[in-house]
């Protein structure tokens, strides 16, 4: 099958960077400049992806593959092969439609992108806040009431002062 | 080919006006919210302002908020920016850029981004 599609259609021994030509008696022709063919047997070549504004160029375009752009500092890449970039912000922040915005009381971003998420709930695990959350930080659970023995809390009290000189009883 | 094309930039005085446009082309506008950002000398990318499908939701950098206003003519297929009481601090290149598919809704990212168009503050 693969012999007989050959002999019928002059087009499929056309390699990758190269289109079939059909203003040429189907001669197979190079990629013109800027556009690539990535695969054999194609009628037409793709024209290249331009990085550009906050796009950088990862990788330049070749007559055989497309160009990849990444992000330029200060944004970072979503959707396949890079397709947008969006804005960072700062921790303790989130990206809204109206810039990046600080997070609410209860809530936190450690990274510079995502949203703000809720602090976590210690009592819904029988634990008590060991660390106050922030708006870059989560709060720290500590142990549960429980787990503490009777009339003990959680912060150590201090040693009892003593005399200097004197050793403990 | 999806394109996006800014013109107006230039050298204007402080506490001058200027006006800016992004026209469109390759895609329908109207379907997508459009953006403004700018890079001034030596700086980062800055978001500038944006505006949804229909004109009625407009945003603003606090740095611009006031002096500065975008708008749209989606039968022209443009968007603009009016910049009044320019400072040299807004010396920058100006680019537009389409918001991608979903945005406000999933993601604040763009696809789309023009050349820029370079403006100039100074006496």
């Known amino acids: 099958f693969e012999r007989t599609r050959s002999l019928q259609d002059p087009c499929s021994n056309c390699p990758a960077g190269t289109f079939c030509d059909n203003n040429r008696n189907q001669i197979c022709s190079p990629c013109p400049p800027n556009s690539f063919s990535s695969a054999g047997g194609q009628r037409t070549c793709d024209i290249c992806r331009q990085c550009k504004g906050v796009f950088r160029t990862r990788k330049e375009c070749s007559s055989t593959s497309n160009a990849e752009c990444d992000c330029t500092p200060g944004f970072h890449c979503l959707g396949a092969g890079c397709s947008m970039c969006e804005q960072d912000c700062k921790q303790g922040q989130e990206l809204t439609k109206k810039g990046c915005k600080d997070c609410c009381f209860g809530t936190f971003n450690d990274q510079k992108r995502g949203i703000c998420r809720p602090w976590t709930n210690c009592s819904l695990d029988g634990k008590s806040v060991l660390v106050n959350g922030t708006k870059e930080r989560d709060v720290v659970c500590g142990p549960s009431p429980a787990d503490l023995s009777p009339g003990a809390s959680s912060v150590t009290p201090p040693a009892p002062a003593r005399e200097p000189g004197h050793s403990p009883q | 080919e999806v394109q996006l094309v800014e013109s107006g930039g230039g050298l204007v005085q402080p506490g001058g006006s200027l006006r800016l446009s992004c026209g469109a082309s390759g895609f329908t506008f109207s379907s997508y919210w459009m953006l403004w950002f700018r890079q001034a000398p030596g700086k980062g990318l800055e978001w500038v302002a944006n505006i949804n499908q229909d004109g009625s939701e407009k945003y603003y950098v606090d740095s611009v908020k006031g002096r500065f206003t975008i708008s749209r003519d989606n039968a022209k297929n443009s968007l603009y920016l009016q910049m009044n009481t320019l400072r040299a601090e807004d010396t920058a290149i100006y680019y537009c850029?389409?918001?991608?598919?979903?945005?406000?809704?999933?993601?604040?990212?763009?696809?789309?981004w023009g050349q820029g168009t370079t403006v100039t503050v100074s006496s």
């Open positions: 850029a389409r918001g991608g598919d979903g945005y406000s809704d999933s993601h604040f990212g763009t696809d789309v």
